[in-house]
């Protein structure tokens, strides 16, 4: 058993039929010695008396809020949560496996630049009685500070018969140099509590590997005389690291109709302009990627050919 | 500790081309190592990230763009002094800081070159003959060093009398390639910045 936060404890259980469970001793946080009784949740049934209560925790019915009283007055609470371990593996029932970039990916993180700011998100089908707490650091043995905000519900989607909820959190490395060469990864730890179930999820990454620039901005078209060619120009996104001559981007320019199966024109360039062939009912799209370290491409920025 | 804006004329920077070739060569070599050594811990997630130049050179600090010198997190206190002549420099316009930056890059290359050559000698003794260093990568390191053209003491190639542990050597190769790729990215950024200034 260990303390998650004040008056909240996590009991780690090997989860299999007829498992013996864990013996837990609860101590009432009071100077009183006599006349103390214990109850669980809203029940008035007295579970025991005395300053300590010894319980055998085997299942979710044994978890919950244990309260010690004296003469009708509440002295203290202890909330017991269960963390299940099945076949030596901690349960991952609360969050959905996003399967990208690989199986067992519960947390996904992205950074728009090298400032040390990043966003992580996760998915669940659970809508109520759900709380998240996020901690992060650079490295684990001698951790350096990363400050994370509160996790918030960022999107709701319908997936078949199920509703899916996306939560996200923003974190910022306390002292980040955009030009630094990372040798220790960022560690992100998410504690998830659903009713009386506790789970934890972790992700480890280098900022350089989770870079995904914002789309290029200010796309403009200039038709070329006596030609079907169009000069398209754009600018670096405002959120990208500066100076741009040091943090350079490369771009992919594509002309395509509404369907992915349609024919297209595509060209890659390090410049902020390119010449392409425009077709009726097609769009010109541009996306960006770090020129020197190939992490993710940005989303497309698009303008219609006409 | 930083690069002032007074640098060579745009497009007149011979090291840019070499640094692009360097990044390409080390990225290709790393990809080849990952594929060939697929049953070894050779991915970014699996290896320890070591920097053989740590406390010996200060390339990131010495080559910091002027715009980042206002960022206190970038101003590490490490300082190293270097020899200050080099052919990538447009002599009259070259600042002392830029010379420091380029000579730090030179020292990095020299250290990695020695490590890679030593490692290759060991890998050539491996009866499995599983992986060798790409001669093109070694040549590109050499070309960039020649373009930088700093006079520097020759670092003797490490020779080892004990029987090489080929498993450890291959893991060390992965560690070295990952670190060198990251340094090659920094070098490319620096050269691009200098070329544009």
């Amino acid at each position: 058993i260990w303390e998650l936060k004040k008056d909240v404890y996590v009991v780690e259980l090997d989860w299999y039929p007829d498992a013996p469970g864990e013996m837990v001793v609860l101590t009432c946080d009071t100077p009183e010695e006599d006349g103390i009784t214990w109850t669980l949740d809203q029940s008035s049934e007295v579970l025991g008396s005395g300053k300590t209560l010894t319980i055998q925790v085997k299942e979710f019915g044994d978890a919950g809020q244990y309260t010690c009283h004296k003469g009708g007055e509440v002295l203290s609470h202890s909330l017991l949560l269960l963390h299940k371990k099945e076949d030596g593996i901690w349960s991952t029932d609360i969050l959905k496996d996003q399967k990208e970039p690989k199986n067992k990916t519960f947390l996904r993180c992205e950074a728009k630049n090298y400032s040390g700011r990043f966003t992580c998100w996760w998915l669940t089908t659970i809508s109520t009685d759900l709380t998240f707490s996020v901690k992060s650091s650079r490295g684990s043995s001698d951790p350096q500070g990363v400050t994370c905000g509160a996790a918030t519900l960022s999107a709701e989607r319908v997936r078949g018969d199920n509703k899916e909820y996306e939560y996200s959190v923003e974190c910022q490395e306390d002292s980040a140099c955009p030009a630094a060469e990372e040798s220790l990864p960022i560690e992100v730890m998410v504690d998830a509590v659903h009713k009386l179930k506790y789970e934890n999820y972790t992700s480890s990454f280098f900022i350089r590997d989770i870079i995904k620039p914002d789309p290029p901005k200010n796309l403009q078209l200039k038709p070329l005389k006596n030609s079907r060619q169009v000069e398209v120009s754009w600018e670096y996104p405002d959120t990208w690291s500066t100076p741009h001559s040091y943090f350079s981007l490369t771009f992919c320019v594509q002309v395509q109709g509404k369907s992915k199966r349609e024919k297209k024109d595509r060209v890659f360039t390090d410049k902020t302009s390119a010449t392409v062939i425009c077709r009726k009912n097609a769009s010109i799209s541009v996306r960006a990627q770090d020129r020197y370290y190939s992490s993710s491409w940005s989303e497309w920025a698009s303008v219609p050919c006409s | 500790r930083n690069l002032p804006v007074a640098t060579p004329d745009p497009g007149m920077f011979p090291c840019l081309h070499h640094s692009q070739n360097l990044l390409r060569a080390v990225s290709n070599m790393l990809q080849k190592a990952r594929q060939t050594l697929e049953f070894y811990p050779c991915t970014s997630e699996e290896i320890d990230h070591e920097d053989i130049t740590k406390d010996k050179t200060s390339t990131v600090e010495a080559c910091l763009p002027l715009e980042l010198t206002k960022n206190e997190s970038c101003l590490n206190s490490r300082e190293t002094s270097f020899i200050t002549n080099g052919s990538c420099l447009a002599s009259r316009k070259t600042s002392f800081m830029m010379a420091l930056c380029l000579s730090s890059i030179y020292e990095d290359l020299k250290m990695y070159q020695v490590e890679f050559k030593t490692m290759n000698a060991k890998l050539l003794m491996d009866p499995k003959r599983q992986i060798f260093l790409d001669q093109n990568m070694l040549a590109v390191i050499d070309e960039l060093m020649q373009a930088l053209n700093f006079n520097s003491e020759t670092v003797p190639q490490k020779s080892s009398l004990e029987e090489p542990d080929f498993y450890k050597t291959k893991i060390k190769l992965c560690i070295l390639l990952h670190a060198f790729r990251i340094r090659a990215v920094t070098i490319d950024r620096v050269m691009s910045y200098l070329n544009a200034s």
Partner: antibody, heavy 118, light 107 residues
């Protein structure tokens, strides 16, 4: 199986014109750009121009501008390349090639030898 | 026009050995570079597109690398059917241009 089948060899006099055909099978004809590329004996490849069969849009290499005309007939899934004012240096194998991407070629025809000789 | 220069123009190789063909552009073309294989009397075949992207159906022994002005086609272990002429082609700008070709011959 996508295929491009070209017309047979031609012998032409200097100053005349030649029209080479390229019939596509497999896939929808108008879903692809169609290009013409030539190769003089013992020489490399030389791009001549492209057509979008969907709308008839064309673009030609400046070297051939005014002398080459590329057309397409959707009903027969056939593209044509006509080269006029022939000279001996136009002796070459002419290839048609196509792709859904405009700037490179994933399927090529077998080639048509055009000999220009007096 | 962008001039594409291949080297060597002729490359004698022993079967089973690796082979590398270089292609240089007269100006930077990013990764807008494609490789083709040509055999006498056969339709040309696309091997690699956008410098390093592999094509399904093309053996994995063919790989491409490079960006900017310098590109390489590598055949890791030459098979008898690989003896042919190889061309690079730039698609950075029109007119599309090819290298002069490299003939890979049996040593």
């Amino acid at each position: 199986q996508v295929q491009l089948v070209q017309s047979g060899a031609e012998v032409k006099k200097p100053g005349s014109s030649v029209k080479v055909s390229c019939k596509a099978s497999g896939g929808t004809f108008s879903d692809y750009y169609l290009h013409w590329v030539r190769q003089a004996p013992g020489q490399g490849l030389e791009w001549m121009g492209w057509i979008d069969p969907e709308n008839g849009d064309t673009e030609y290499a400046p070297k051939f501008q005014g002398r080459v005309t590329i057309t397409a007939d959707e009903s027969t899934s056939t593209a044509y390349m006509e080269l006029s004012s022939l000279r001996s240096e136009d002796t070459a194998v002419y290839y048609c090639a196509r792709n859904k991407e405009l700037r490179y070629f994933d399927v090529w025809g077998q080639g048509t030898l055009v000999t220009v000789s007096s | 026009d962008i001039v594409m220069t291949q080297s060597p123009l002729s490359l004698p190789v022993t079967p089973g050995e690796p082979a590398s063909i270089s292609c240089r552009a007269s100006q930077s073309i990013s990764i807008n570079l494609h490789w083709y294989q040509q055999k006498p009397g056969q339709a040309s075949r696309l091997l690699i597109y956008f410098a390093s992207q592999s094509i399904s159906g093309v053996p994995s022994r063919f790989s491409g690398s490079g960006s900017g002005t310098d590109f390489t086609l590598t055949i890791s272990s030459l098979q008898p059917e690989d003896f042919a002429t190889y061309y690079c082609q730039q698609s950075n700008s029109f007119p599309l241009t090819f290298g002069q070709g490299t003939k890979v011959e049996i040593k």
